[in-house]
């Protein structure tokens, strides 16, 4: 996994990487494997429902760089690792949701009589 | 340089295997993809399937599955395609290639002979 | 499978000549990463293949500059400007967007 301050941009890989992808296959995978020139990926995000949905797949090297930093989002529970290690790495790759916030429900000061 | 070295030829005898060789060098071996490729005269190329040397992970053509095995030996830079129950169909030239993206390098092929 | 059909299948050229040969794919060759995985191969007799462009347009390291790539999607074009003796031969073109990898039938170039 990517660390969230690191900022040089990946270097590219000789050789084609092949990844798993599930929810998440381009056209031109075959049997739910699509390949790439940057990173394969696996993401957990909470659903509309508020239920976790894991995706995997590739990422190109462009813009791969931004997109495996998992930089947080506000208001949105997501996690996402990468690795370009060996082929289908994201097969092994498990993130988890970061915990849910502690929320301030009120919305103003509060005025007591 | 980069060079894939190939036997020129082989002879086999229907129904039976044979394993063939393509030795690499000037390069890193597993930085590389390699590809096997079929010739038969007046039928083109074919590509017969790929394998990764850094973790043997392979991907086949489905038209060769059952037909080819690829495999590598890492320590001395050697990529082999089992090939097994032989016919006249399977007499032809096999090309070993490297690729990354494109393949760059051939080797320069074995004529597969399939004769009783 | 993706079918590449190259034309003509023969191409007589006096030398000197301009040369052209088509590939059309059965699908485009973008791939998902947005580069297209199309190149053009010279097969000489009894020799294998080498490469002379790669990704549509790229020269190969020793390729002069007289060969040219052209083309997207479906719809690529080799070009020789000034075709010499040791031009001769077979050209393939391949693509290797998707698995698995398919070639053209070749195209033969030949002196008139």
């Known amino acids: 996994k990517k660390e969230d301050g690191e900022s040089t941009a990946p270097t590219p890989r000789p050789k084609v990487l092949r990844c798993k992808c599930h929810h998440h296959c381009p056209e031109d995978s075959v049997n739910n494997i699509c390949s790439t020139d940057g990173y394969c990926f696996t993401m957990i995000e909470e659903d509309d429902s508020g239920l976790p949905v894991v995706t995997s797949g590739c990422l190109g090297l462009e813009g791969s760089d931004f997109q495996c930093r998992d930089t947080p989002i506000p208001h949105q529970r997501r996690s996402i690792e990468c690795c370009t290690e060996r082929n289908e790495c994201n097969k092994d790759l498990h993130p988890t949701l970061p915990p849910l916030k502690n929320r301030d429900f009120v919305d103003g000061p509060i005025h007591h009589r | 340089q980069v060079q894939l070295q190939q036997p020129g030829a082989e002879v086999v005898k229907p129904g039976a295997s044979v394993k063939l060789s393509c030795k690499a060098s000037?390069?890193?071996?597993?930085?590389?993809?390699m590809q096997w490729v079929k010739q038969r005269p007046g039928q083109g190329l074919e590509w017969i399937g790929e394998i990764d040397p850094s973790d043997r992970y392979t991907m086949y053509n489905q038209k060769f599955k059952g037909k080819a095995t690829l495999i590598v030996d890492t320590s001395s830079s050697t990529a082999y395609m089992q090939l097994s129950s032989l016919t006249s169909e399977d007499s032809a030239v096999y090309f070993c290639?490297?690729?990354?993206?494109?393949?760059?390098?051939w080797g320069q092929g074995t004529t597969l002979t399939v004769s009783s | 499978d993706v079918v590449m059909t190259q034309t003509p299948l023969s191409l007589p050229v006096s030398l000197g000549d301009q040369a052209s040969i088509s590939c059309r794919s059965s699908q485009s060759l973008v791939h998902s990463t947005g580069n297209t995985y199309l190149h053009w191969y010279l097969q000489k007799p009894g020799q294998s293949p080498n490469l002379l462009i790669y990704?549509?347009?790229n020269r190969f390291s020793g390729v002069p500059d007289r060969f040219s790539g052209s083309g997207s999607g479906t719809d690529f074009t080799l070009k020789i400007s000034r075709v010499e003796a040791e031009d001769l031969g077979v050209y393939f073109c391949s693509q290797s967007t998707h698995v698995p990898f398919t070639f053209g039938s070749g195209t033969k170039l030949e002196i008139k």
């Open positions: 990704k549509v347009s």
């Open positions: 290639a490297r690729f990354g993206y494109y393949v760059d390098y």
């Open positions: 000037g390069y890193t071996f597993t930085n590389y993809w």
